[in-house]
Each structure stands twice: as structure tokens, then as C-alpha cells.
């Protein structure tokens, strides 16, 4: 079955290379068990930033490496992304599933632009 | 519970034809994108080529010409055409469906497509060779 996966359409990250967003799904179930991943999609290229499957009413957990931090608020899920540079602009698109109890629903969000300017550095002072 | 039931592979000689099905059911939302994926022993799935809601088709270059998608919504099923086959054909196709129309059409040019897709079949082999 499909749902509906609302997100931002542009996010500017910040000059600390952070960027966030809130990607919200119309669920039509009571689900309990839910897994969002991140995609990025640049030159003809789709790649998994992150991926993190949490329990309904608890924390999302990713990966201790992870360049992704998030939390859930009903079916609101608040994404960070850190670490970012200029290299990495591009479409990251938020996809969510409801894995329990069945059925087995699936959205995929148009995708929030991300633009990350990486800093001037700073001049030098004599 | 949505299922997706492809048929139709085969052993076919270089420049044979074949027909691919799949049936769906159990899926209810009307815009969607429906695909056909391939992979081949070692590699990494890819796009074939897709057909929107709508029946808007795009193909993968290594097929254009050769390789035709259609549905019938009538009987919810999927085909594939594949003309003129050669041994680089050679793989397990699936047939799968995408929730979101927006990356419908560049997915058979685009690199890791498969994410946008959720549901898939089990696969039918198909084997060119002589």
C-alpha cells in the first residue's frame, strides 16, 4: 500500500554544514514499528545517506557513525543532517515505511533540495 | 497484502524474443510508477524501463528499440516485450512498484533507482544463449 510523505521543498544548510528538515507521513494505520531512510540524489546517482527503524513513541536510533540525527513526534519525523559541504547539494528524499503490524505501507517525499555553502575562511590577521 | 507475480522467462537464442507478465494485486493506490528491473549474476539490480500511472514510458539505453513495457489495467498485469535479446540480457527480471510518479521516468538513467521502489516480485530468469 502507499501513503502520502510530505517534506520541505528547500533547505539551506547552515555555515556549520547542518541542515534540517521534518518529513511527515499520512499514515493509514496504527503502525508501531517504522523505518525512515534518507536518499540523495546527484548526478543520475541514488545513494542511502541513512536509515534508522524506531519504535512508535521512541527515539529514532541510527547508527553510531551516522551523519544523521532524528526524532519522531506522532507521524512527524524530524530530521538533522551534519557534516555537509558544498559537495554534497543535492535532492535528499525521504522515505518511510510501516513495518508492523501489517500491512506493509510504503512513502517516498519529492524530495527536500538541499544547498550546503561551504564557508569562507576566515582572513588571516597581521 | 500486495503481491507481484512475473512469468514468461526462459532460455531464448540471440536474437529471439520473449515475453515477460506480472500480475499484481492487492495494491489499490492509482499513481504510482510500475518497473522492470533486472540483475545479472554479480552485478547490481537496474532499471530496465518504467510506465506511469499515466503511460508514460522510459527505457534504459541498452534497450531502446529492442524492449517494449505496456499494462493492461484491466487485468492488473505488466508486460515486457524484449526483441532481438542478447547474451548481455541475460539476468533475473523483476517487476516492481514505486509510490511516488516523480521518479518514474529517469529511473531507468539513474543509478540506484531501486530505492524509489517498494514491492517487488520474485524474479524470472531470463537466459540468451546459443
Known amino acids: 500500500k502507499a501513503m502520502h510523505v510530505a517534506q520541505p521543498a528547500v533547505v539551506l544548510a547552515s555555515s556549520r554544514g547542518i541542515a534540517s528538515f521534518v518529513c511527515e507521513y499520512a499514515s493509514p494505520g496504527k503502525a508501531t514499528e517504522v523505518r525512515v531512510t534518507v536518499l540523495r540524489q546527484a548526478d543520475s546517482q541514488v545513494t542511502e545517506v541513512c536509515a534508522a527503524t524506531y519504535m512508535m513513541g521512541n527515539e529514532l536510533t541510527f547508527l553510531d557513525d551516522s551523519i544523521c540525527t532524528g526524532t519522531s513526534s506522532g507521524n512527524q519525523v524530524n530530521l538533522t543532517i551534519q557534516g555537509l559541504r558544498a559537495m554534497d547539494t543535492g535532492l535528499y528524499i525521504c522515505k518511510v515505511e510501516l513495518m508492523y503490524p501489517p500491512p506493509y505501507y510504503l512513502g517516498i517525499g519529492n524530495g527536500t533540495q538541499i544547498y550546503v555553502i561551504d564557508p569562507e575562511p576566515c582572513p588571516d590577521s597581521d | 497484502e500486495v503481491q507481484l507475480v512475473e512469468s514468461g522467462g526462459g532460455l531464448v537464442q540471440p536474437g529471439g524474443s520473449l515475453r515477460l507478465s506480472c500480475a499484481a494485486s492487492g495494491y489499490t493506490y492509482s499513481r504510482h510508477c510500475l518497473g522492470w528491473f533486472r540483475q545479472a549474476p554479480g552485478k547490481g539490480r537496474e532499471a530496465v524501463s518504467t510506465i506511469s500511472s499515466g503511460g508514460s514510458t522510459s527505457y534504459a539505453d541498452s534497450v531502446k528499440g529492442r524492449f517494449t513495457i505496456s499494462r493492461d489495467n484491466a487485468k492488473n498485469t505488466l508486460y515486457l516485450q524484449m526483441n532481438s535479446l542478447r547474451p548481455e540480457d541475460t539476468a533475473v527480471y523483476y517487476c516492481?512498484?514505486?509510490?511516488?510518479?516523480?521518479?518514474?521516468?529517469?529511473?531507468?538513467?539513474?543509478?540506484?533507482?531501486?530505492?524509489?521502489?517498494?514491492?517487488w516480485g520474485q524474479g524470472t530468469l531470463v537466459t540468451v544463449s546459443s
Open positions: 516492481a512498484i514505486g509510490p511516488n510518479p516523480r521518479y518514474c521516468s529517469g529511473a531507468p538513467s539513474t543509478r540506484g533507482a531501486e530505492h524509489y521502489f517498494g514491492y
